[in-house]
């Protein structure tokens, strides 16, 4: 018995179905086929879970969280024992193993391993201004999404005037910040933060209004 090489890693957007491949060759009939799918969750590597089981011509549910979401892609028994997972969740991310036995065919590689990563687009980021908006001050524009896998990167842009950040601006795409030093009237305007990762983007807006000093009456 020989389980074929798997693609190694599969990525899927949260909520979408995933197919985890596992095929094998055997010299024996499929009368005594036994297939166990296990997962080692990324969130709990010390606690492997059973996903689905085929034994004695019957299918059995694995861990409760997979109930109603998991099944074999084809009619069993077969040499293609790939499974699907519907409505993928973040907690489905992990390393999946198919263990195949088909007596009396013993020996060879009877395990296939496939990694599953469930991706999450950035949630709507939160935009805020840190610091005084008085002319001549330094301000920081902050942007962060609570959700996003892979971790989002952040790009600040200006949506009015010359369509670019002031030359005194320094951008950090990882932290989601823009520091604008020595703000002037030209720094005023509409700023947009774009949070993006491999599967999506999300935006938020900030209206920066630089405050000019009020003339004081000397009496």
């Amino acid at each position: 018995l020989e389980v074929s090489e798997s693609p190694g890693s599969i990525q899927v957007a949260r909520g979408q179905p995933a197919v985890l491949p596992c095929t094998f060759t055997t010299s024996a009939a499929l009368i005594n086929l036994n297939v166990i799918w296990m997962v080692t969750p990324l969130s709990n590597a010390n606690q492997p879970e059973q996903v689905i089981l085929y034994q004695g011509g019957q299918m059995f549910d694995g861990a409760p969280r997979f109930h109603g979401r998991v099944g074999f892609t084809g009619t069993m028994p077969a040499t293609n024992v790939s499974i699907f997972i519907n409505n993928t969740q973040l907690s489905d991310t992990g390393t999946y193993q198919c263990l195949v036995n088909n007596l009396p065919d013993i020996g060879g590689r009877n395990i296939g391993v496939t990694g599953l990563t469930v991706l999450v687009p950035p949630s709507a980021p939160h935009c805020q201004i840190q610091g005084s908006q008085d002319i001549g001050s330094d301000v920081i524009l902050l942007c962060s999404s609570e959700e996003g896998i892979p971790r989002p990167t952040y790009l600040w842009e200006k949506l009015d005037n010359t369509l670019k950040l002031p030359p005194t601006a320094t951008q950090d795409q990882v932290q989601g910040t823009v520091t604008i030093r020595n703000i002037s009237a030209l720094s005023s305007g509409l700023y947009q933060c774009v949070a993006s990762n491999a599967i999506g983007t999300s935006t938020c807006l900030l209206d920066l209004q630089v405050i000019s000093p009020q003339p004081r009456n000397i009496g």
Partner: antibody, heavy 121, light 110 residues
Framework: EVQLLESGGGLVQPGGSLRLSCAAS????????LSWVRQAPGKGLEWVSA????????YYADSVKGRFTISRDNSKNTLYLQMNSLRAEDTAVYYC??????????????WGQGTMVTVSS | ASVLTQPPSVSAAPGQKVTISCSGS????????VSWYQQLPGTAPKLLIY???KRPSGIPDRFSGSKSGTSATLGITGLQAEDEADYYC???????????FGGGTKLTVL
């Protein structure tokens, strides 16, 4: 090497469409606002359209508004100009240009070599 | 016609000084920065001056810029044969959300 390279120009009939591309290399593409500028044969420079670093903001010259669309793909470091309902007066060399991050005002510090668009029947 | 007015042509002898004007209004030059470009025959334009009077690295100090009210001026001293080119000013109008070039000035070195 820091450069911009336009492509997609050619001969097109009046009323037709064309999409120009501008491939950038050697700098952090998404940090820069970009523009398309054109020059009709024997004439001066004419600004056509501009787009912000993330693509969220864009401006157009009155002469192309409603017919041309500027866009960018930051994952491919590429700027585009979709030109529809082309007219004979759109015949020109089209340049893409980068707006300097060192300037408060508009200042195109990097230009492509240009691509020729000819609108003729 | 461009909303920024430049003289169609200027000329001067080598070693001399020349100025090129760019005239606009309060909606463009009057409230915004100006940049200047040199275009040699058959080539793409090149940035000479930005933010009214700043020179990018590599631009010789023979080139200078200034702005007063609704007009901007490019100055070139110690004229050289290789300065023969077309020169353009550029600014933007906040209200119209457009960038605008001047009509261009052809500089001839006699």
């Amino acid at each position: 090497e820091v450069q911009l390279l336009e492509s997609g120009g050619g001969l097109v009939q009046p009323g037709g469409s064309l999409r120009l591309s501008c491939a950038a290399s050697g700098f952090t593409f998404s940090f820069y606002s970009l523009s398309w500028v054109r020059q009709a044969p024997g004439k001066g420079l004419e600004w056509v359209s501009a787009i912000s670093g993330g693509g969220g903001g864009s401006y157009y010259a009155d002469s192309v508004k409603g017919r041309f669309t500027i866009s960018r793909d930051n994952s491919k470091n590429t700027l585009y100009l979709q030109m529809n309902s082309l007219r004979a007066e759109d015949t020109a060399v089209y340049y893409c240009a980068r707006d300097s991050r060192d300037a408060y005002g508009v200042a195109f510090d990097l230009w492509g070599q240009g691509t020729m668009v000819t609108v003729s029947s | 016609a461009s909303v920024l007015t430049q003289p169609p042509s200027v000329s001067a002898a080598p070693g001399q000084k020349v100025t090129i004007s760019c005239s606009g209004s309060s909606s463009n030059i009057g409230n915004n920065y100006v940049s200047w470009y040199q275009q040699l025959p058959g080539t793409a334009p090149k940035l000479l001056i930005y933010d009214n009077n700043k020179r990018p690295s590599g631009i010789p100090d023979r080139f200078s810029g200034s702005k007063s009210g609704t007009s901007a001026t490019l100055g070139i001293t110690g004229l050289q044969a290789e300065d023969e080119a077309d020169y353009y000013c550029l600014t933007w109008t906040g209200a119209g959300r457009i960038f605008v070039f001047g009509g261009g000035t052809k500089l001839t070195v006699l």
